[in-house]
Interface confidence: low
Amino acid sequence: EAHKSEIAHRYNDLGEQHFKGLVLIAFSQYLQKCSYDEHAKLVQEVTDFAKTCVADESAANCDKSLHTLFGDKLCAIPNLRENYGELADCCTKQEPERNECFLQHKDDNPSLPPFERPEAEAMCTSFKENPTTFMGHYLHEVARRHPYFYAPELLYYAEQYNEILTQCCAEADKESCLTPKLDGVKEKALVSSVRQRMKCSSMQKFGERAFKAWAVARLSQTFPNADFAEITKLATDLTKVNKECCHGDLLECADDRAELAKYMCENQATISSKLQTCCDKPLLKKAHCLSEVEHDTMPADLPAIAADFVEDQEVCKNYAEAKDVFLGTFLYEYSRRHPDYSVSLLLRLAKKYEATLEKCCAEANPPACYGTVLAEFQPLVEEPKNLVKTNCDLYEKLGEYGFQNAILVRYTQKAPQVSTPTLVEAARNLGRVGTKCCTLPEDQRLPCVEDYLSAILNRVCLLHEKTPVSEHVTKCCSGSLVERRPCFSALTVDETYVPKEFKAETFTFHSDICTLPEKEKQIKKQTALAELVKHKPKATAEQLKTVMDDFAQFLDTCCKAADKDTCFSTEGPNLVTRCKDALA
């Protein structure tokens, strides 16, 4: 239904707190360099304006679109060109081009310092003094570093943050209460960020149809008792919600997501028997809970997939009459039978089925041609299954840090031209798949591993797009989203790469490394490992292990020495010499 004032409508639907939080996220994601105070001022102005529109929808400018209102606000910021360069050119355009321009200038890797968590006591003090401002800072800092973070989910994580602080700040030992809990929220939020970025990439590069296919597969796995019409309705609504969030329409997105949660809770009988617990929760928790609800029990009497999609004499007729519906039904039927497959794999199978019908339905004897299609799925299914087994075995043998190092070597060999920080970040993230997925029951490993890897590799592609340096990476990132992971897995050592010359300073360390937190130490060591591989791309695993063990021993010795500086300056050059010899 049309509203005289869109901003009044959203303010009323969302309530002041959500409205302000979402506007703050939107501004922080568009203008990533502005301070919290600058954004907070804009948010207050927008909120005050929204309130005037609530009081009188026909007041001046209340009928303007949200893009116009928000864009005008952003374009009125002083020193926009000095701080944001060519982004200021967006302000010369009219809507909807202006918003598109803003979206194109979102930076997936902004040059902002890492978000450092304050010390527990200081955090609790500022939280108690003004919880609203404290939460505002959290939303601002996360949103500007993750310009595609799913806004209603970010409100949920802020809620988690708030609850943890409320609980832990009342404890005697605040630090030991806060640290593990906030680490947990941070880990989940980072995974949420890369997953959502993948959804936005799918939408941006391949359109709504591609996202809807993803949604049909995912929803069919989760709700195998829902019929195809129900799944299609949910997929359509979910596509709209994600399109809005990816497009910067955060108020509409949050509002529609709340509507979708409401619909699901009102229609549990036709969707799933597992929703009640989620539906008993307040809004933000409810929507989050529904997004990761456990799979419903599969119906016991599902017929074999072949009946309708291989053996039926009308296959080509049904396909020709309504291609999208027929393929959608295939994806639905296959997915509801396979909660143990990744969405990426299910989409590859649907693509294979589509290609087979395109080819076979044009032939003289279609049934003879497409009759073996299900058997042809076998290699497509075996490949990711083998990937999971191999990698989980390696993870169990090496542990997370060792597994990250193995991946770092592998990916540096595949794409040695990529910058070392990007390779280290990617390897560390890819390596976390072990901890995240390999401990799960067998039937949950494949979907966990492959869909997580796909999301991480999407980030690799986005960073590489900014400064393309590797033909290997360009090749894998140019193809379809679902083929990326198999493409990266299949890459071997880049034979075109000319090894970097050995620079002693790359492997020279100082005593300040001793006081770094464990994570930072690991990053330093992994940076050295990537540089070693760039110097010797064909070094054996044994050679690299020797060097890294020597390096670890050197750090251990010098960090325990009475005179650390002397130890580093005398033992360091010896280490460099030994490294060169070991890799000769």
Epitope: N12, G15, E16, Q17, K51, P131, M135, A158, E163
Partner: nanobody, 116 residues
Amino acid sequence: EVQLVESGGGLVQPGGSLRLSCAASGSTWSINTLAWYRQAPGKQRDLVARISSGGSTYYADSVKGRFTISRDNSKNTLYLQMNSLRAEDTAVYYCYAQSTWYPPSWGQGTLVTVSS
């Protein structure tokens, strides 16, 4: 969390009026929607009226034109002005707060009896 305390209930004759109040305390900054629900003996709890932080209101059909919901943000108080009361309005009236950062909160309820 948000704590809610209702007051103003009591016995009233058909056609009479009552004003219910609900005082909110705790993390009141996080409240976005306030509402009144009621539960008659042996029945489920039903929404009577709600008001968003933007001031927009909603009323159940059975009370439209007779009841008015309002809020005073400076006092963190919600009100329900009930006019032309009928026997079927007899129920325990509950104050409800939906919050951005916390689970929803309910008051303990105040009894309204309409009888001659």
